[in-house]
């Protein structure tokens, strides 16, 4: 006999990275017929919602009107059908951005390279932070973590056309409080690759430095969010 229900999906709209003082909605999608949803923040009960009528609703929203550093952290949700509770959702890392200062991002040897060339990003911020984050924009975005007193290096290694895209970096004051984003840097990778094994669909990065986020930068991408797990996997876990 089933003791728990399947875990719900949790995500943030419009994004898990929320500028301070801006609004964000945490969405939790379970099953039709769920009579109660609970949102937990850093392991403690944060909010409860009881959808009406439960048989016609499979998703609830928890609205945060004014994002700040106290609201940033790890969220999860559970739901109940009758007396049976679900497994907890994956953890959603909600990050507050636009804190304090703006880093500068540069790329060597330059923003336009040939496939196979080694590329390194540099994120610099002169204020008190020792951790930096490099993000590539897009639905399947990758976040790389780097360390340094005022600057962090992000070596991508030999690049392929899959590395093309727009990059930004942040200084991180703690796990969930990030600086303003840098100005974007667009990396262009040209050149036909003879050895197609060098061109994966997505860049692969060392497991110890990369966490994968499935991001949605558009609010209306998909109504059926069960198709997508928009959970931000905790980069620092």
């Amino acid at each position: 006999q089933q003791q728990t229900l399947p875990k719900p999906f949790i995500w943030a709209e419009p994004h898990f990275m929320v500028p301070k003082e801006k609004q964000v909605t945490i969405c939790c999608q379970g099953n039709y017929g769920a009579v109660e949803y609970q949102l937990h923040f850093e392991g403690s009960l944060f909010a409860v919602d009881r959808p009406k009528p439960p048989e016609r609703i499979n998703k609830v929203q928890f609205y945060i009107p004014d994002m700040n550093s106290r609201m940033a952290g790890q969220y999860s949700c559970i739901y109940r059908v009758g007396e049976l509770w679900s497994e907890p959702s994956n953890l959603l890392d909600l990050v507050v951005t636009e804190m304090y200062d703006t880093p500068t991002l540069s790329v060597h040897p330059g923003p336009e390279v040939i496939s196979g060339e080694k590329v390194t990003f540099y994120c610099r911020l002169d204020t008190a932070t020792s951790m930096f984050l490099l993000l590539k924009e897009g639905r399947s975005s990758h976040v790389q973590r780097g360390y340094g007193k005022v600057q962090a290096e992000f070596p991508l290694g030999p690049v392929t056309t899959a590395h093309r895209g727009t990059y930004r970096c942040f200084g991180s004051y703690n796990n969930h409080a990030w600086s303003f984003p840098s100005e974007p840097v667009k990396l262009l990778v040209t050149g036909d690759i003879e050895n197609t094994s060098l061109a994966p669909e997505d860049p692969t990065f060392p497991a110890d430095t990369w966490g994968t986020y499935l991001l949605t930068t558009e609010t209306g991408l998909q109504k059926d969010h069960a198709l997508w797990d928009h959970t931000a996997q905790n980069l620092l876990r």
Epitope: S106, H108, P109, I114, E117, K118, T120, P158, G191
Partner: antibody
Framework: EVQLQQSGPELVKPGTSVKISCKTS????????MHWVKQSHGKSLEWFGG????????SYNQKFKGKATLTVDKSSSTAYMELRSLTSEDSAVYYC???????????WGQGTTLTVSS | DIVMTQSPATLSVTPGDRVSLSCRAS??????LHWFQQKSHESPRLLIK???QSISGIPSRFSGSGSGSDFTLSINSVEPEDVGVYYC?????????FGPGTKLELK
């Protein structure tokens, strides 16, 4: 010591082709892209194109579209530029130059003088 | 294509002079600007990378500044061996482009 040794001067007839070589030593050939730069007599420098020995990926200056083909031989750590349909306009000194991934063209060959004349 | 222009075309100097060579890009290239020196019958040599960063083995009298589209190479006390042509290079976008050069000569 990093060295880029280019092939000797060439005197060729219009309409023919020529293949210039750039033999490298002193570093890992596949880690740096190799670029070719043209310098006509008394003129500035013009980037012809570049190749990544690691992947075989190339990028060409569209101004010289179809004029050159860049290749490498990894076994001998040598880069090549083949120029075709030569005219007197192609008479120049051609340099190979290594593009460092933390700067620009940090090492250059000594240049190969190409003269196209009937 | 990004067009690089340099001024002056020729600069006549006396040893010990402090000189400034100008380079302008047709659009912003941030700090992706490199300077080269080419002496007569020699290959070019990298002097300054990323607008202002020094290169190992290059005398400290050479320095660079600027960002965006306006850049300057300075030689704070010219030596006779500095005679040659100085080129700036766009390292931002393909095609990589060079300026027409500034010829430095002795008076």
């Amino acid at each position: 010591e990093v060295q880029l040794q280019q092939s000797g001067p060439e005197l060729v007839k219009p309409g023919t082709s020529v293949k210039i070589s750039c033999k490298t030593s002193g570093y890992t050939f596949t880690e740096y892209s190799m670029h070719w730069v043209k310098q006509s007599h008394g003129k500035s420098l013009e980037w012809f194109g570049g190749i990544s020995p690691n992947s075989g990926g190339t990028s060409y200056n569209q101004k010289f579209k179809g004029k050159a083909t860049l290749t490498v031989d990894k076994s001998s750590s040598t880069a090549y530029m083949e120029l075709r349909s030569l005219t007197s306009e192609d008479s120049a000194v051609y340099y190979c130059a290594r593009r460092d991934f933390h700067s620009s063209f940090d090492y250059w060959g000594q240049g190969t003088t190409l003269t196209v004349s009937s | 294509d990004i067009v690089m222009t340099q001024s002056p075309a020729t600069l006549s100097v006396t040893p010990g002079d402090r000189v400034s060579l100008s380079c302008r890009a047709s659009q912003s290239i941030s700090d992706y600007l490199h300077w080269f020196q080419q002496k007569s019958h020699e290959s070019p040599r990298l002097l300054i990378k990323y607008a202002s960063q020094s290169i190992s083995g290059i005398p400290s009298r050479f320095s660079g500044s600027g960002s965006g589209s306006d850049f300057t190479l300075s030689i704070n006390s010219v030596e006779p061996e500095d005679v040659g042509v100085y080129y700036c290079q766009n390292g931002h976008s393909f095609p990589l482009t060079f300026g027409p050069g500034t010829k430095l000569e002795l008076k």
